[in-house]
């Protein structure tokens, strides 16, 4: 992510005194953490990440803000209306239906602080929640009562 | 969420001047926001929410840490080892794998912030990658070469 | 009564392409999936790949990364193409109609003659 | 990928004797949800294409003899030759369909003592 300070009055101040500091994790990559560069299809892989071998195949699109935190989302796109076969990975089983898993991620949005007489005194961060798709699900239909 | 100052300096200062507030948005709360209800079996319902549906069905389990937000995580628990077979939703399909879907998610820890001096100035929010599992979903199970 | 017919040169040299065509006659070939199978000389049977009309394909991934099969509805034909041939792709190529039920593949019924295909310089 | 291992290679046989050939697969081709063995047999004659003989395990296709009969589920399958007749001469062949890649056994040469 680009660097913005989080907490900061209109003077200047300097980074070590910043009430609010980001520091980044080296975490390895995980699946879904950046899309798919397999070539999108409706059919499940052998190999690559989950959402290519998944038999409800989906692709990742990124949602960039950058006055939010995390400024990098992806949402999930569901590459097949139902799921693929488990017999082939290639051809579509309509017994089952692919559907997006939704979530409600807390975001935090870089907004204007103003002080007590409506003065500006820097940056706040506003916590938001954010829907976003993380996957798509192969499910039963639903059956109507 | 219980609430806490996020950027709080050591001497008290008006809410209204928080440098760091938290307002929480009113969302209808979306299936994997919380666990399960339906009873927890390795089968695929017909109605339910959608990891009651899932050919890869889940539970969710609470990881609270009232120094982090979101306070709340829940994490992923698949229920079967294979997928559920889309035409009984009860026999498992051993063609399928039932595999957790991970994600990095950006949280924030609560954590001492100190001066230039060593001297104790409230708290900093530390940001970190917090591994969490999303969702269980059916794969078609590896192809070794 | 649905019969099949593979047809193409008996005679392919190393490092091209083989390509053979198998004609349908007694079924439309949009109600089906068709698949090509290989018999070394004295060997047994190797599964190559499938197709249904609208273009779904799957192939053996031994054979993958070589193996390219298409339709022509027009003409009720299907094709294989495998690149790159060496003497060990030498074998009877037969095409075969594939059962397809319960939205799975089935068994293969029923088979082209055959047509032996030799890879040499 | 699933590998079927049939025994023995070959096979002679008095006419009108049983034949008995083995098929055996690597991993089960059996699915509990719809009570089926994704295994076929097939009998393959000098310079023909192979014919299918029976399907889910032990489902005769019609038009063949019943002296043909299949047996076996999960990982281990039988095809029996009651009363061997000379045209049953051939090379016979399993295969699954349980998941792709669909594969063959090695096949097992019949012949008359």
């Known amino acids: 992510y680009s660097h913005w300070p989080s907490c900061c009055p209109s003077k200047g101040q300097d980074t070590s005194e910043e009430l609010l500091r980001w520091s980044t994790v080296p975490v390895p990559p995980l699946e879904p953490a950046r899309p798919n560069r397999h070539p999108e299809s409706c059919r499940a892989s052998e190999d690559g990440p989950l959402n290519s071998r998944a038999i409800s195949p989906w692709r990742y699109e990124l949602d960039r803000d950058l006055n939010r935190l995390p400024q990098d989302l992806y949402h999930a796109r569901c590459l097949c209306p139902h799921c693929v076969s488990l017999q082939t990975g290639s051809h579509m089983d309509p017994r089952g239906n692919s559907e997006l898993l939704y979530h409600n991620q807390t975001v935090f949005y870089r907004r204007p602080c103003h002080g007590e007489k409506g003065t500006h005194k820097g940056y706040c961060l506003e916590r938001r929640l954010y829907r976003v798709s993380l996957a798509c699900v192969c499910v039963r239909p639903r059956v109507m009562g | 969420y219980s609430h806490w100052p996020s950027c709080c300096p050591s001497k008290g200062q008006d809410t209204s001047e928080e440098l760091l507030r938290w307002s929480t948005v009113p969302v209808p709360p979306l299936e994997p926001a919380r666990p399960n209800r339906h009873p927890e079996s390795c089968r695929a319902s017909e109605d339910g929410p959608l990891n009651s549906r899932a050919i890869s069905p889940w539970r969710y389990e609470l990881d609270r840490d009232l120094n982090r937000l979101p306070q709340d995580l829940y994490h992923a628990r698949c229920l079967c080892p294979h997928c559920v077979s889309l035409q009984t939703g009860s026999h498992m399909d051993p063609r399928g794998n039932s595999e957790l879907l991970y994600h990095n998610q950006t949280v924030f820890y609560r954590r001492p912030c100190h001066g230039e001096k060593g001297t104790h100035k409230g708290y900093c929010l530390e940001r970190r990658l917090y591994r969490v599992s999303l969702a269980c979903v059916c794969v078609r199970p590896r192809v070794m070469g | 009564q649905v019969q099949l017919q593979e047809s193409g040169p008996g005679l392919v040299k190393p490092s091209e392409t083989l390509s053979l065509t198998c004609t349908v006659s007694?079924?439309?070939?949009?109600?089906?999936?068709w698949s090509w199978i290989r018999q070394p000389p004295g060997k047994g049977l190797e599964w190559i790949g499938y197709?249904?009309?609208?273009?779904?394909?799957n192939y053996n991934p031994s054979l993958k990364s070589r193996v390219t099969i298409s339709v022509d509805t027009s003409k009720n034909q299907f094709s294989l193409k495998l690149s790159s041939v060496t003497a060990a792709d030498t074998a009877v190529y037969y095409c075969?109609?594939?059962?397809?039920?319960?939205?799975?593949?089935?068994?293969?019924?029923?088979w082209g003659q055959g047509t032996l295909v030799t890879v040499s310089s | 990928d699933i590998v079927m291992t049939q025994s023995p290679d070959s096979l002679a046989v008095f006419l009108g004797e049983r034949a008995t050939i083995n098929c055996r697969s690597s991993?089960?081709?059996?699915?509990?949800?719809?009570?089926?063995?994704?295994l076929a047999w097939y009998q393959q004659k000098p310079g023909q294409p192979p014919k299918l003989l029976i399907y889910?395990?032990?489902s005769r296709e019609s038009g063949v003899p019943d002296r043909f009969s299949g047996s076996g589920s999960g990982t281990d399958f039988t095809l029996t030759i009651n009363s061997l007749q000379a045209e049953d001469v051939a090379v016979y062949y399993c295969?699954?369909?349980?998941?792709?890649?669909?594969?063959f056994g090695g096949g097992t040469k019949v012949e008359i003592k």
């Open positions: 075969a109609r594939v059962r397809f039920s319960d939205y799975e593949l089935n068994w293969f019924d029923p």
């Open positions: 007694g079924a439309s070939i949009s109600n089906y999936y």
């Open positions: 197709i249904f009309y609208s273009g779904n394909t």
């Open positions: 991993q089960s081709v059996f699915l509990g949800s719809n009570n089926k063995n994704y």
């Open positions: 889910w395990a032990s």
């Open positions: 295969q699954q369909y349980f998941i792709t890649p669909l594969t």
